[in-house]
Interface confidence: low
């Protein structure tokens, strides 16, 4: 075994924007740190066989399997996958090691299996075996976190029953409104499951794993805040835990808080209280109302009362299954070329939705903002004044919702022309959709004022790529106009554009645009 080469097998995971992945299998661009796959000699095998550790890959991920060979002289190689031979081009790195790579772009089921690499060096022949499988993300879940009280402690535990186990973090903020956005300096994150500091203004718990990030906010009534004109509303599904926090600050201890459901005191075991001094020696009290697993009869108005503050209520609604409430009728908008405009969808949903905006088969991130009245709103402003069809799609665990928007940009027509042996056609995507005229240019009409009405066919077509309407006009060629210049003009309320076409024989035509 003295002459056996030193073999190193590595896996390189590429980020999925493809920019880091080489298109040729010989020189992949390595942007991520390689993972050592071991490559141990397989015992009791005929010939010299090295086996790499099994590789599990996400669907659509891009990877490189790479072998580094420390052996003198040249090497030749061959990849075999599912009985097919694949080209193999070894090269040498700076340490003079032979490097053999196999790039798998956008992993699919058909690319899973055993990859055999046969290497022939001056001293010996050997085989390297890689087993590549697709990670079973069907088993993956990411569930919204929920809260539990820690036994015998004034603390909340955040739980997310997800696979793989998520990283749980508390997101805390002590200021009001806009300044509690995730990126704000007022926001503090704590990567732990248990939270003792329960007096903050805004408390959320987030769980994240390979599938993304889900957050749950601790629903709070603050008796020192002016009550909203509409009651805050909290939706829950049957079986979920209910947590509501009532918070109040007073100059001294001389006040208490109570929770009532529909004017009846909450049952024992369904509340607990905490209090603390704030820096200016005022007293902060919080009273939690909780139900470990809600039923339909837990629906109702929950009122938090204090001996020193006005009472405030929240409407808790328990539903059998989730919902998305919004009007799904399609909406058409007509705007000027430089007009500021955003699409918006107002909806009420539980659980919180995941959403996307789509235009021309391209998806854009979707942001949601909660309104005071229990509704949420999603806006899309990044249309860059491109006319066409925009789609808002939202879904949660139980419901789906799609809404279509059409954006028309008011602009003067732009005319494009093409011609064949038998006809000439002009196209325009101006809006409002233009009307057409054809004119013949001749000795009698050097300014092209002689109108052509025969053989003209106008139509409106939907350019599917952008979902925008294109108007076209086609002139069938007759002997009367062959060899002449003709002019097609598109006009709407914003202006006119024309193209001049020489009708002679098939082939490239000279087009003269005159606006």
């Amino acid at each position: 075994n003295q002459d056996l080469p030193v073999i190193k097998c590595v896996l390189i995971n590429h980020k999925n924007n493809d920019s880091s992945v080489g298109k040729s299998s010989s020189y992949p661009m390595v942007s991520e740190s390689p993972e050592d796959l071991g490559c141990a000699l397989r015992p009791q095998s005929s010939g010299t066989v090295y086996e790499a550790a099994a590789v599990e890959v996400d669907v659509s991920a891009s990877i490189t399997l790479q072998v580094l060979v420390d052996a003198p002289g040249n090497i030749s190689c061959l990849w075999v996958f599912k009985h097919s031979s694949l080209n193999c081009q070894p090269h040498f790195d700076l340490q003079n090691r032979g490097v053999v790579s196999m790039v798998i772009l956008k992993m699919t089921e058909t690319q899973a299996g055993e990859y055999l690499l046969f290497i022939q060096s001056e001293a010996t022949n050997y085989t390297i075996l890689f087993t590549v499988s697709i990670r079973n993300t069907l088993l993956y879940t990411l569930r919204r976190p929920y809260f539990r009280k820690m036994e015998n402690q004034d603390a909340l535990v955040c739980i997310s029953e997800s696979v793989p186990e998520p990283i749980v973090e508390w997101v805390l903020c002590d200021s009001q409104g806009e300044s509690c956005k995730e990126e704000s300096p007022a926001v503090v994150k704590k990567e732990e499951k248990v939270l003792h500091e329960l007096f903050g203004t805004d408390i959320r718990c987030c769980a994240r794993n390979e599938l993304g990030r889900e957050c749950t906010r601790l629903f709070t009534i603050d008796l020192n805040q002016t009550p909203q004109t509409t009651l805050p509303q909290l939706f829950l599904k049957v079986g979920e835990p209910l947590w509501i926090r009532c918070k109040a600050v007073h100059v001294n201890h001389g006040f208490g808080l109570t929770w009532e459901l529909e004017n009846k005191a909450l049952e024992e075991g369904n509340y607990f209280e905490m209090s603390t001094y704030s820096t200016n020696r005022t007293m902060i009290r919080i009273l939690f109302a909780f139900v470990s697993s809600v039923a339909r009869n837990d629906t109702g108005y929950y009122t938090c009362s204090s001996s020193k503050h006005p009472s405030q209520s929240a409407l808790v609604t328990i539903v059998e299954k989730g919902f998305i409430n919004a009007t799904n009728s399609s909406e058409d908008y007509e705007i000027d070329q430089y007009e500021e405009f955003c699409f918006s969808v107002r909806f009420k949903a539980y659980p919180q939705i995941r959403c996307t905006w789509t235009f021309s088969r391209k998806s854009f991130p979707c942001e949601q903002k909660g309104l005071d009245n229990g509704y949420s709103i999603s806006k899309f402003c990044n249309h860059k004044h491109q006319p066409g069809e925009y789609i808002f799609h939202a879904e949660n665990d139980d419901a789906q919702f799609t809404k279509m928007f059409t954006l028309n940009i008011r602009r003067k027509p732009q005319v494009l022309a093409e011609a064949s042996a038998s006809q000439a056609s002009c196209f325009s995507d101006g809006y409002p959709l233009p009307s057409w005229t054809w004119k013949k240019c001749s000795d009698k009409s050097p300014n092209c004022t002689e109108e052509i009405t025969e053989g003209v066919w106008n139509r409106k077509a939907n350019r599917k790529v952008f979902g925008q309407w294109v108007s076209s006009s086609t002139l069938n060629m007759s002997e009367a106009i062959k060899g002449f210049l003709v002019k097609c003009c598109a006009y709407n309320s914003l202006g006119t554009s024309c193209e001049t076409i020489l009708l002679n024989s098939p082939g490239p035509f000279p087009f003269i645009q005159d606006n």
Partner: nanobody, 111 residues
Framework: QVQLQESGGGLVQPGDPLRLSCAAS????????IDWYRQAPGKQREWVAQ???????HYEPSLKGRFTISRDNAKNTAYLQMNSLKPEDTAVYYC?????WGQGTQVTVSS
């Protein structure tokens, strides 16, 4: 519904100690904070001390050192140990959980 019953009050001489008890019915005793308050004749009710569910204590600054609050979760009872009593400690003493109050127990300090 939580019910609270104070006991242990009485007439004592200045400088004497006294221990008040607050017995609570209801399974949520251990989960909640307990406050002691007092109300002297013709005055507003004032806060005296508090013990949290975790056993942390807070006191009205002027009483700290003389008064000690404690709790026995197994007995669903809270205590207020008052030492070196003064005539100005004369008041009806109340215990409070959440927004539930006991009937009060009279403490009179007089020579």
């Amino acid at each position: 519904q939580v019910q609270l019953q104070e006991s242990g009050g009485g007439l004592v001489q200045p400088g004497d100690p006294l221990r008040l008890s607050c017995a609570a019915s209801g399974s949520t005793f251990s989960r909640n904070y307990i406050d002691w308050y007092r109300q002297a004749p013709g005055k507003q009710r004032e806060w005296v001390a508090q013990i949290t569910s975790g056993g942390n204590t807070h006191y009205e600054p002027s009483l700290k050192g003389r008064f000690t609050i404690s709790r026995d979760n197994a007995k669903n009872t809270a205590y207020l140990q008052m030492n070196s009593l003064k005539p100005e400690d004369t008041a009806v003493y109340y215990c409070r959980i959440l927004d539930y109050w006991g009937q009060g127990t009279q403490v009179t300090v007089s020579s």
